[in-house]
């Protein structure tokens, strides 16, 4: 056993090292450990086949270390892993496309926080058995077409707290059996119409904090089994290109967050669900510093570059933004409910999803909504105090959207076996 | 710096019910899932129940169902545990508590990072 | 529900020594398990939660590992203001359960 760690056998052959002050994977790693734990080191490297004597390893934590650097064949020969831990290495930003093949088993990777600038082609190939995938608060910018195509059984898509800026259509190609994916606190400002195409399983959908000032509902009309939609904190557009998404919502039986509208100003800070159709009228068109709301190619139908309902003659004159108004609708969040829709009472009772740091975030000032986030600025964050998890209404397979713990405190029966959060 | 501020001791009557109340600042109650913790003289450690965020409910361990409520009052950010029936073996140091994974939002660590200093009840007749 | 066990019960300890608490579960709560340090009159302390990650301000001294059902913290080179009792905490579903406590007394 290496001199700073402790090595033992019951329940499983362990090799624990942590917080040691490690700079290096130590040599001497008994060949038959089955879990590594080399967190909270001083690691920036791991050379190639650093554990490929270590054939029954199914758990390996190398989070919170100082990683600049992993070989492409670092993990060679672990045909057995199952958990792969590399968060918190904030140095590591890019990772070799190769590093991960033939990890056959893997079910859960965490990557969150390692300062990633992009994913590389073919860099989760092969991980058919992967069922949770840790990306967020990186530094991604783009999700490359058929990233995850490989990744039928994964059920859970962490991408929160990066700087995407767009959901192009073949992002989440593969992802049959997704049940949670979280895109919020990012930059996003378009998502292609068939972006969510596979996602039939989908529950839990997060796109609260991104520059939505608009979503095509074809993009929502796979999404057969959603149960928790979150679009609070985007610069939403309430005018006529709004009424498909109103109608959407309308009929959405599932939970979902407000939808507070930024533009056109006599709406600024209303819920979009608690609109009448007849209050989705005209258009409101940004212009002078902020960016079109709308970008779509000049047609017969379009010919402005506008949507129909936004041509000249659809338009009602009154509620066109004119050049250089603010498209500022200042704290347009804050209120749960919407003036005049207060519930009576003194507010104590059940909470419900508006409620939820979903649709205030906590900690932090909320900046005027604008249409646009200016570049360069992060989206509003939740304290980093550390990092959070259903079939089983196990906490920890957390998204437990469909299973209702309680009736009242019967705790759930889950088994936590497998990766969640 | 978020604090969990709680009511005075209380001396009650078997039989009767106390309500300890936990007032949150620095932020705001509706952005925090807050759960209770019970804890009696020499003895260790009780999770009684707390609002779970997931499935937006509030949970209860099985011991307690039907003699605690767990309630807020979100115009005064303030989280209220409510317990009847007492008998002299509640007599003891009551909790509330932050939990941690809540505002991670995603990454599910759940734990309970901030504590009230605690809230000491005592039944007796 | 869970049943969290922990070992010793009580351990007595010289100032710079390592000491070992452990804690197992009843079933696989993967590596959803927190560590909590509480001193006599005082709420408990967070020092550890997903099994190994550190919380913010706690010193490099403690360490968690573990995963499925056994999980360890670790004290490496003790100091006399870490005599307290500590109990880990499973927080894979409801009912959260702790486990029973561990005194730790300094020499």
């Known amino acids: 056993c290496p001199g700073a760690c402790v090595c033992y056998n019951e329940p499983k052959v362990t090799t624990s090292c942590p917080q040691q002050g490690l700079q290096a994977v130590p040599v001497g790693i008994p060949a038959a450990s089955q879990r590594i734990f080399l967190h909270g080191n001083r690691i920036s490297h791991v050379p190639a086949a650093s554990f490929r004597a270590c054939r029954n390893l199914t758990i390996l934590w190398l989070h919170s270390n100082v990683l600049a650097r992993i070989d492409a064949a670092a993990f060679t020969g672990l045909a057995l892993l199952e958990q792969l831990d590399l968060s918190d290495n904030a140095q590591l930003r890019s990772v070799d496309p190769a590093t991960f093949h033939g990890l056959g088993r893997l079910h859960t990777l965490h990557l969150d926080r390692c300062g990633l600038q992009e994913l590389g082609p073919g860099l989760f190939r092969g991980l058919a058995a992967l069922q949770y995938l840790y990306l967020q608060d990186n530094a991604l910018q783009a999700l490359p077409d058929d990233t995850f195509r490989d990744l039928g059984n994964l059920t859970h898509l962490f991408l929160h707290g990066n700087r995407i800026s767009s959901v192009p259509e073949r992002a989440f190609r593969g992802l049959h059996s997704l049940d949670r994916l979280l895109l919020h606190q990012n930059r996003v400002a378009h998502v292609h119409p068939h972006a969510f195409r596979d996602l039939g399983r989908l529950m839990t959908l997060y796109l609260f904090a991104n520059n939505l000032s608009a979503l095509p509902t074809e993009a929502l009309a796979p999404l057969r089994a959603l149960q928790y939609l979150r679009l609070n904190d985007n610069p939403w557009v309430c005018d006529c290109r709004a009424r498909p998404l109103w109608a959407w919502l309308q009929k959405f039986r599932g939970s979902s967050s407000e939808v507070p509208c930024s533009l056109p100003q006599r709406l600024a800070g209303r819920d979009l669900k608690r609109l009448a159709a007849n209050d989705l009228q005209g258009c409101a068109v940004a212009t002078g510093p902020y960016h079109p709301i709308w970008t779509g190619r000049a047609t017969d139908e379009e010919p402005l570059g506008l949507p129909k309902c936004c041509q000249p003659d659809a338009a009602d004159k009154a509620s066109v933004l004119e050049p250089g108004r603010p498209a500022s609708a200042g704290n347009a969040l804050k209120g749960r409910v919407p003036p005049g829709d207060s519930p009576p009472g003194n507010g104590s009772g059940p909470r419900h999803i508006n409620d939820s740091p979903f649709g205030t975030l906590p900690g932090s000032a909320e900046p005027p909504l604008t249409a646009v986030r200016p570049e360069g600025s992060e989206p509003p964050g939740f304290p980093t105090s550390g990092p959070r998890r259903r079939p089983g209404c196990s906490r920890k397979n957390r998204t437990r959207s469909h299973c209702r713990l309680g009736q009242a405190g019967s705790g759930g029966g889950g088994t936590g076996d497998s990766e969640g959060s | 710096q978020m604090q969990l501020v709680q009511s005075g001791a209380e001396v009650k009557k078997p039989g009767a019910s106390v309500k300890v109340s936990c007032k949150v600042s620095?932020?705001?109650?509706?952005?925090?899932?807050i759960h209770w913790v019970r804890q009696a003289p020499g003895k260790g450690l009780e999770w009684m129940g707390g609002?779970?965020?997931?499935?937006?409910?509030?949970v209860y361990a099985q011991k307690f169902q039907g003699r605690v409520t767990l309630t807020d009052d979100t115009s005064t950010d303030t989280a209220y545990m409510e317990l009847s029936s007492l008998r002299s073996e509640d007599t003891a140091v009551y909790y509330c508590?932050?939990?941690?994974?809540?505002?991670?939002?995603?990454?599910?660590?759940?734990?309970?990072?901030?504590w009230g200093r605690g809230t000491m009840i005592t039944v007796s007749s | 529900d869970i049943q969290m066990t922990q070992s010793p019960s009580s351990v007595s300890a010289s100032v710079g020594d390592r000491v070992t608490i452990t804690c197992r579960a009843s079933q696989d709560i993967n590596r959803w398990l927190a560590w909590y340090q509480q001193k006599p009159g005082k709420a408990p302390k967070l020092l550890i939660y997903a099994a190994s990650r550190l919380q913010s301000g706690v010193p490099l001294r403690f360490s968690g590992s573990g995963s499925g059902t056994d999980f360890t913290l670790t004290i490496n080179s003790l100091q006399p203001e870490d005599s307290a009792t500590y109990y880990c905490q499973q927080t894979n579903n409801f009912p959260r359960t702790f486990g029973q406590g561990t005194r730790l007394e300094i020499k």
């Open positions: 609002f779970d965020p997931e499935d937006d409910e509030t």
């Open positions: 508590a932050r939990d941690l994974g809540y505002l991670t939002s995603g990454n599910y660590y759940d734990a309970f990072d901030i």
């Open positions: 620095g932020y705001t109650l509706s952005e925090l899932s």
